[in-house]
């Protein structure tokens, strides 16, 4: 019969508010008190197996003892009532678990969405963590009809999907009740027509059609979601070129009501565009649909919009009365070619004489010309037509170029090599910029680009390397031929030299030494050599550093000690740092030349 508990604790299953006070009472049964010869004075209270100090106990009567907790901070307390029996042995009487937590807060930010074709889903902010099982119930009603409660699932406690069909044009009232063992609260009620909460399905079957008449347009067609019969739709249409990562958007005011097609204008010819579209209720109440699947189309070709860059080079070794001229041009970028380039047409007209025609597939043409003045034209052709002509005057052999650009400068900025100049007073048709890498090992292979006559600042559009010295030449081109070229050297990005200078002695005296060195080869300079530093020391002395201008190739060390071994090395510096050359040693003589002779004579 003693398997029966010796007593009980009241309350049996308490749930209390965190940081509140709580009192439990342990009541002993008479038969237990008799059996163990105890009363309430013998009760020992424990939480999680730790004895509670007696000061927290209250003896109510011979059978009952209470314990009071203030400011409960634990979520779960195992409370046991025990009695001290013979020989101070503890006997468990009863145990309970005190669960603590917080009452629910009033749910906030209740909002609902009707995904087209699905039932209405509402979500809310449930408030702080209660540490207790808290049930959320979504309530909804019409003025004349209560709908079944929607009980939020344990794993998604702050949203619920109703189980009735959505009816548009009828106002519905919705609210949330939150309830746990410590209380029940209700959110504010919201009242709305579900038509204002619609998230439409995205438009589908998006397709793109091009126009043979206009190379700057593409027509989009799509199928609207079924909800179009209930709401007027507005759209976002976005597009980008195939390789771009950012989207452009059609002005929303152009697509502000239900439609199933749209013509996108001001596009580039012969360009692949990707489109996507989404929709929502036209007054902006509700939600945007997801984006449609993307669809792409290519605008129709147009004739090339620009003449190619056009230049020439004359072979310096020419036979009597003739010269070899290489005409060169650049392929147009796709946005100017406007289609697949078929060929180039070159015409050459000897001054006031007959015309020669050439059709070329490459981007150069080598011709033998007399020493006369020639007019060359170049057009590029695609399926639709020809570009405007680029015109070039190849002056006669005795032509004297004049009027160069002035104040030519070149400098790196934003990982590009910029060139700027002051324009000559004369009317310039265009500028030709040529550049090549200066190297001791290889010839200067020229790349070039053309700029409009109004330009006086540009960057080199080649594939430039860092730490290479570029020789940049700017030639203004006039109606009657090229002007005088101007050149400048520049680096895209400097680095310290790869090697330092090798210093040697030219002449060594008792108290001075003339050092000499070679200019660093351009391939190892990696930048403009701004200055040199000569470091010299004796075996036991401190090192001395001397700065030397970069234009020098020799330097005299003075005030040296005679009959002394010197170690000397030299560093060359660019704007990005320096590099030491190898160390060289020399010894100063004991006597100056005259002194040695004088000693011999004396003896």
């Amino acid at each position: 019969e003693l398997l029966d508990p010796c007593g009980y604790i009241s309350p049996e299953s308490p749930v209390v508010q965190l940081h509140s006070n709580f009192t439990a009472v342990c009541v002993l049964k008479e038969k237990c008190m008799d059996y163990f010869h105890v009363n309430a004075n013998y009760i020992v209270w424990k939480t999680n197996h730790f004895t509670i100090p007696k000061e927290q106990y209250t003896i109510i009567n011979r059978t009952a003892s209470s314990v009071t907790f203030t400011d409960i901070a634990s979520l779960n307390i195992q409370l046991t009532c025990n009695i001290l029996t013979f020989g101070q042995l503890e006997q468990n009487v009863y145990g309970i678990t005190i669960i603590s937590g917080l009452p629910p807060e009033k749910p906030k930010n209740l909002s609902c969405i009707v995904n087209e074709g699905k039932k209405m889903r509402c979500e809310w902010d449930g408030g702080r963590e209660t540490h207790l099982e808290t049930n959320f119930t979504l309530k909804s009603e019409w003025a004349t009809h209560k709908f079944a409660d929607c009980k939020a699932k344990r794993d998604t406690p702050t949203s619920c999907t109703v189980d009735y069909s959505t009816v548009y044009f009828v106002n519905i009232e919705v609210w949330v009740e939150a309830e746990n063992a410590l209380g029940k609260v209700t959110s504010d009620h919201i009242n709305f027509d579900p038509v204002y909460k619609v998230k439409p399905n995205p438009p589908h079957n998006l397709s793109v059609i091009n126009s043979e008449e206009l190379s700057s347009i593409l027509k989009l067609t799509w199928t609207n979601p079924s909800i179009k019969s209930v709401i007027i739709l507005k759209y976002n249409i976005q597009y980008r070129t195939k390789d771009a990562s950012t989207w452009s958007q059609i002005p929303p005011e152009d697509t502000a009501s239900t439609r199933s097609s749209f013509t996108v204008q001001d596009l580039k010819p012969f360009t692949e565009y990707v489109f996507r579209i989404r929709c929502m209720k036209e007054d902006g109440k509700g939600y945007w649909s997801d984006w449609s699947e993307e669809a792409s189309g290519i605008t129709y070709e147009d004739r090339p919009s620009k003449a190619p860059s056009f230049w020439y080079k004359i072979d310096p070794s020419h036979t009597q009365g003739y010269r070899t001229v290489q005409l060169v041009w650049k392929t147009l970028p796709p946005f100017e070619a406007n289609g697949k380039i078929l060929d180039y047409e070159v015409t050459l007209t000897r001054w006031k004489s007959h015309l020669q025609n050439y059709t070329v597939n490459a981007t150069k043409l080598t011709v033998n010309l007399t020493n006369d003045r020639y007019l060359a034209t170049l057009t590029v052709r695609n399926l639709v037509g020809k570009s405007d002509a680029a015109v070039l005057t190849i002056p006669a052999c005795d032509f004297q170029a004049t009027h160069p650009v002035m104040d030519l400068k070149a400098f790196p900025k934003d990982n590009m090599l910029w060139v700027e100049w002051t324009t000559p007073r004369e009317s310039v048709k265009k500028y030709i910029l040529e550049w090549c890498v200066l190297s001791d090992k290889a010839p200067c292979i020229t790349d070039w680009q053309q700029e409009d006559g109004t330009v006086h600042r540009t960057y080199l559009r080649g594939n430039l390397a860092e730490s290479k010295c570029y020789l940049i030449t700017v030639t203004p081109v006039y109606a009657d031929g090229p002007g005088s070229p101007e050149s400048i050297k520049a680096y895209l990005k400097q680095a310290p030299p790869s090697k330092g200078p090798t210093v040697r002695t030219k002449k060594v005296g008792k108290n001075e030494a003339v050092l000499e060195w070679d200019q660093l080869p351009v391939d190892v300079q990696n930048g403009f050599i701004r200055n040199y530093t000569i470091f010299y020391r004796t075996i036991i002395g401190n090192e001395t550093a001397v700065n030397v201008d970069s234009s020098h190739t020799e330097y005299t060390l003075s005030s040296l000690t005679s009959d002394t071994l010197y170690m000397v090395r030299m560093a060359a510096y660019t704007d990005e740092g320096g590099k030491d050359g190898p160390e060289f040693t020399f010894t100063t003589p004991k006597f100056a030349q005259g002194e040695i002779e004088h000693h011999h004579h004396h003896h």
Partner: antibody
Framework: EVQVVESGGDLLLPGGSLKLSCAVS????????MSWVRQTPDKRLELVAT????????YYPDSVKGRFTISRDNAKHTLYLQMSSLKSEDTAMYYC?????????WGQGTLVTVSA | VIVLTQSHKFMSTSVGDRVSITCKAS??????VAWYQQKVGHSPKLLIY???TRHTGVPDRFTGSGSGTDFTLTISNVQSEDLADYFC?????????FGGGTKLEIK
């Protein structure tokens, strides 16, 4: 007591236009969506237009879209149906009803006959 | 478009009997169904909505049941004033549509 009274029905030629009215009393007009439902001579019922309580959303089936326009004046407790480009198949008794999923309150109807 | 089929155009019953009028939807309409009674020369009158909920003032001998595609209006203890046409209607998706009607005749 709820009262719904339609008016404006007439006999007219195909291609003609007509405006029906519906006066409502006995319930809070501006709290309800309203509809026009027609019943053809063979007793078939068809919803022809619905408008929400504040008048900014409407619905029309394909059979009347672009030809019929539903509107309401909440101050006057009145519902309207403007019909144009009428066809012989539009011949029917036109009822005005408040909309609550079902249609709780209907008027007595107004007859529209389209015939050459 | 959801089509509602009331397979019996006419049904005959006696006063005091129980009669069931059926309505079948061409696709799932959940419980978004209403039933109407129309007596000769009168406008339709709402009896049931949400498939099972009686409209205000409708006698409890009218009972609605069903969900999905199959719905029934049951009149128990038929009275002579129940002589009328009965229509079902769905409001699950636009266009909201009506059945063709069932005429209840009293023997």
């Amino acid at each position: 007591e709820v009262q719904v009274v339609e008016s404006g029905g007439d006999l007219l030629l195909p291609g003609g236009s007509l405006k029906l009215s519906c006066a409502v009393s006995g319930f809070t007009f501006n709290a309800y969506g309203m509809s026009w439902v027609r019943q053809t001579p063979d007793k078939r019922l068809e919803l022809v237009a619905t408008i929400n309580s504040n008048g900014d959303s409407t619905y029309y089936p394909d059979s009347v879209k672009g030809r019929f326009t539903i509107s309401r004046d909440n101050a006057k407790h009145t519902l309207y149906l403007q019909m144009s480009s009428l066809k012989s198949e539009d011949t029917a008794m036109y009822y005005c009803a408040n909309f609550y999923g079902g249609f709780p309150y209907w008027g007595q109807g107004t007859l529209v006959t389209v015939s050459a | 478009v959801i089509v509602l089929t009331q397979s019996h155009k006419f049904m005959s019953t006696s006063v005091g009997d129980r009669v069931s009028i059926t309505c079948k939807a061409s696709q799932d309409v959940d419980t978004a169904v209403a039933w109407y009674q129309q007596k000769v020369g009168h406008s339709p009158k709402l009896l049931i909505y949400w498939a099972v909920t009686r409209h205000t003032g409708v006698p409890d001998r009218f009972t609605g049941s069903g969900s999905g595609t199959d719905f029934t209006l049951t009149i128990s203890n038929v009275q002579s004033e129940d002589l009328a046409d009965y229509f079902c209607q769905q409001y699950s998706s636009y266009p909201y549509t009506f059945g063709g009607g069932t005429k209840l005749e009293i023997k």
